[in-house]
């Protein structure tokens, strides 16, 4: 197994609808054909898995049906979108990339993207 560099933005602000998108780019040393991408959330020194997908190069990323993540791939870039975020979900989201095939196995872990989520203010009642 070998190490690999993974780049991702330092900070992303989620939309008012609780959607955050960022690009995860990995420095593939060769022509990988099977890639696994995992998003991890680190908060208070606890690391939890948010979502994961294995994809064959050239195909779409397929997350589980109940996943809060969607994504597309283009070359060595993965465009990730996380939905349904609330203020309590603010934290560091780490992109992990594994090159599963062909050998050797490579693992790359990004430095993380700090995603800030601000719950929208409720609309004030308006009198007409």
């Amino acid at each position: 197994c070998k190490a690999m560099h993974v780049a991702q933005p330092a900070v992303v602000l989620a939309s008012s609808r609780g959607i955050a998108s960022f690009v995860c780019e990995y420095a593939s040393p060769g022509k990988a054909t099977e890639v696994r991408v995992t998003v991890l959330r680190q908060a208070d020194s606890q690391v939890t898995e948010v979502c994961a997908a294995t994809y064959m190069m050239g195909n779409e990323l397929t997350f589980l049906d109940d996943s809060i993540c969607t994504g597309t791939s283009s070359g060595n870039q993965v465009n990730l979108t996380i939905q349904g975020l609330r203020a309590m979900d603010t934290g560091l989201y780490i992109c992990k990339v594994e090159l599963m095939y062909p050998p050797p196995y490579y693992l790359g872990i990004g430095n993380g993207t700090q995603i800030y989520v601000i719950d929208p203010e409720p609309c004030p009642d308006s009198d007409f």
């Epitope: 197994c1 054909t33 099977e34 696994r36 995992t38 991890l40 690391v47 898995e49 994961a52 294995t54 064959m56 780490i94 992990k96 594994e98 599963m100 095939y101 062909p102 196995y105 693992l107 872990i109």
Partner: nanobody, 119 residues
Framework: EVQLVESGGGLVQPGGSLRLSCTAS????????MGWYRQAPGKQRELVAD???????NYADSVKGRFSISRDGAKNTVDLQMNSLRPEDTAVYYC?????????????WGQGTQVTVSS
């Protein structure tokens, strides 16, 4: 806790066949590369074959065309079908799982099963 348990080893004559099976416990099977390695007396452990979660396979040159690896996600098993066995295939065969757990690379090994090819 992850455990890999092998079965199916034994004594077989040259030209014969054996099927090794490895059962994985723990939540790793769908995420890890599963493989078989072997170690003959006085030699280093070497890769025989492995299979990715997506079903891509990789074989050592010495077993290509004779051995076949497969995985069953429903049963959490990985099998190695060994045909046209030769005396030089004699070794202890180990099941292996390679992948990552959160931020760490992990590799797990079974206890091994003896395969002896002799007349």
């Amino acid at each position: 806790e992850v455990q890999l348990v092998e079965s199916g080893g034994g004594l077989v004559q040259p030209g014969g066949s054996l099927r090794l099976s490895c059962t994985a416990s723990g939540n790793i099977f769908s995420r890890y590369i599963m493989g078989w390695y072997r170690q003959a007396p006085g030699k280093q452990r070497e890769l025989v074959a492995d299979i990715t979660p997506g079903g891509n396979t990789n074989y050592a040159d010495s077993v290509k065309g004779r051995f076949s690896i497969s995985r069953d996600g429903a049963k959490n098993t990985v099998d190695l079908q060994m045909n046209s066995l030769r005396p030089e295939d004699t070794a202890v065969y180990y099941c292996n799982a390679l992948g990552s757990d959160k931020l760490l690379i992990r590799t797990y090994w079974g206890q091994g099963t003896q395969v002896t090819v002799s007349s």
